[in-house]
């Protein structure tokens, strides 16, 4: 018999995206006569969610049968909640009026917060490869989560990293949020098999964090080391010279032999030997017919790796006085069958 009061018992309700939200509202009286309406927000810009009197509200159902005698429950359920539904909902009693109904009394409001899962973290690395001892940046992004509170951690091979910076946007209130983090990682020679992991924890994930990974193999370049050696003679007039290309990554490699500065042969590394740390080795060899030379020969192994500036190593092959008296062609032979070159680049030659 008290004058009508609008009771919204819950100050706040939290719902997972995709679920239904029940917003409770009760009246203490049937008088004054007039419809109940639900709004999101207050003031002139408020959004009509449900009108007892008229309209079509496909996502809204009333919890009670409103036409049932002595019903004072005007709770509603909103289906398929999304982050865009977040806000404060007001149950408002209107008094019949002419020509328009007049707002009589409003409930205190119920704040609906929507728990939305963050998207799977996407980790991206640097655009260009870097060599060991250099620092590279990895970014991690995730979107669409709510509420705003979120935890992001970085790991490298299971070890937590500390050199990173994280931002959650926007700074103010929003229906959903995004996170962006940049981690700085110092590369080491053994990082070909390494992984960086971005791990995100959020209330919606129930203790099972989301992870995004990136392989350092996409970010690292390990330059090769070259060693040119002469093997024992197969025959008195043949010299066997090998170029050992060691511990390089990635595999793209082109090798050129030069004799006294003139290109003798170019080949592209194909069948490689993979080391435990993920780097590769390759060997090329050259058979030199010493009879063909009257003077000493400088043999140069020149390697262009992953499109970088060529590196080279030279070996001085001494021709004995006896051999200088005879002349013949040079014979070359590769230790491994060459394949078509992977790259054709302009190279700079360095002779050591």
């Amino acid at each position: 018999e008290d004058e009508l009061q609008v009771i919204q018992p819950e100050k706040s309700v939290s719902v997972a995206a995709g679920e239904s939200a029940t917003l409770r509202c009760a009246m203490t009286s049937l008088i004054p006569v007039g419809p109940i309406m639900w709004f999101r927000g207050a003031g002139a810009g408020r959004e009509l969610i449900y009108n007892q009197k008229e309209g079509h509200f496909p996502r809204v159902t009333t919890v009670s049968e409103l036409t049932k005698r002595n019903n004072l429950d005007f709770s509603i359920s909103i289906s398929n909640i999304t982050p865009a539904d977040a806000g404060t909902y007001y149950c408002v009693k209107f008094r019949k009026g002419s020509p328009d109904d007049v707002e009589f009394k409003s409930g205190a409001g119920t704040e609906l917060s929507v728990r939305a899962k963050p998207s799977a973290p996407v980790v991206s690395g640097p655009a260009v490869r870097a060599t060991p001892e250099h620092t590279v940046s990895f970014t991690c992004e995730s979107h669409g989560f709510s509420p705003r509170d979120i935890t992001l951690k970085w790991f490298k091979n299971g070890n937590e990293l500390s050199d990173f910076q994280t931002n959650v946007d926007p700074a103010g209130d929003s229906v959903s949020y995004s996170i962006h983090s940049t981690a700085r990682v110092v590369l080491t020679r053994g990082d070909v098999h390494s992984q960086v992991i971005c791990e995100i924890a959020h209330i919606t994930l129930q203790g099972d964090p989301l992870r995004g990974t990136a392989n350092l193999s996409e970010a690292i370049r390990v330059p090769p080391t070259l060693e040119v050696t002469q093997q024992p003679m197969r025959a008195e007039n043949q010299a066997n010279v090998t170029c050992q290309v060691s511990n390089f990554y990635p595999r793209g490699l082109q090798l050129t032999w030069l004799e006294n500065g003139n290109v003798s042969r170019t080949e592209t590394a194909s069948t490689l030997i993979e080391n435990k740390d993920g780097t590769y080795n390759w060997m090329s060899w050259l058979l030199v017919n010493t009879c063909a030379h009257r003077d000493d020969v400088v043999l140069t192994c020149q390697v262009e790796h992953d499109g970088q500036q060529a590196v080279s190593k030279s070996y001085a092959l001494e021709i004995s006085a006896h051999q200088k008296e005879h002349g013949s062609d040079i014979t070359h032979e590769a230790a491994l069958a060459p394949t078509a070159p992977l790259h054709h680049h302009h190279h700079h030659h360095h002779h050591h």
Partner: antibody, heavy 114, light 111 residues
Framework: QVQLKESGPGLVAPSQSLSITCTVS????????IHWVRQPPGKGLEWLGV???????IYNSALMSRLNISKDNSKSQVFLKMNSLQTDDTAMYYC????????WGQGTLVTVSA | NIVLTQSPASLAVSLGQRATISCRAS??????????MHWNQQKPGQPPKLLIY???DLESGVPARFSGSGSRTDFTLTIDPVEADDAATYYC?????????FGGGTKLEIK
């Protein structure tokens, strides 16, 4: 217990104003609306208007220009003011409580006469 | 304004018999599943007293001899059986629309 008591001038000269006070006890004006109803001698009841708990009012459109209802919650008093009285405003004036007019005062008789 | 027309204006009923009073509204007084029609009893020199609210709900303390029925525009107050104390004027009243309005009254006399 719930009580409502009207107090008025009794006699009012034509074209003058009427002021009636309804003093309530046993409940708070912040919880209940108060309505005003009048009844000319030997005739039926006429609803004049209401003041809701928040202080907003609704008046009978036939009398709206002449009526004013106000209240003082702290004094538990509701006031009816009516101007330009004529002889046909002679009536018993009642205040009543709530949505179904469950509780009434005993009324105060107002006679408009020169 | 909604006009309420009561009939008869007066009636005399023998003690122990049934009294039926009618109230017709100029337009429907139903809204949102309820009929906002109420019945009051007034004895001479006294303020009105609520008997029935929302067309059929009996007010606390009122004898079950009183009952109300009807919807939309046609409503009935029934007193069965009538007792001597029931002699009074009966008013229907609506609050579905502003202004709230009363019927003209029906005077019940007990024979």
């Amino acid at each position: 217990q719930v009580q409502l008591k009207e107090s008025g001038p009794g006699l009012v000269a034509p074209s003058q104003s009427l002021s009636i006070t309804c003093t309530v006890s046993g409940f708070s004006l912040s919880s209940y609306a108060i309505h005003w109803v009048r009844q000319p001698p030997g005739k039926g009841l006429e609803w004049l208007g209401v003041i809701w708990t928040g202080g907003s009012t609704i008046y009978n459109s036939a009398l709206m220009s002449r009526l004013n209802i106000s209240k003082d919650n702290s004094k538990s008093q509701v006031f009816l003011k009516m101007n330009s009285l004529q002889t046909d405003d002679t009536a018993m004036y009642y205040c009543a409580r709530g949505n179904y007019l469950r509780y009434w005062g005993q009324g105060t008789l107002v006679t408009v006469s020169a | 304004n909604i006009v309420l027309t009561q009939s008869p204006a007066s009636l005399a009923v023998s003690l122990g018999q049934r009294a039926t009073i009618s109230c017709r509204a100029s337009e429907s007084v139903d809204s949102y599943g309820y009929s906002y029609m109420h019945w009051n009893q007034q004895k001479p020199g006294q303020p009105p007293k609520l008997l029935i609210y929302l067309a059929s709900d009996l007010e606390s303390g009122v004898p079950a001899r009183f009952s109300g029925s009807g919807s939309r525009t046609d409503f009935t107050l029934t007193i069965d059986p009538v007792e001597a104390d029931d002699a009074a004027t009966y008013y229907c009243q609506q609050n579905n629309d502003d202004p709230w309005t009363f019927g003209g009254g029906t005077k019940l006399e007990i024979k």
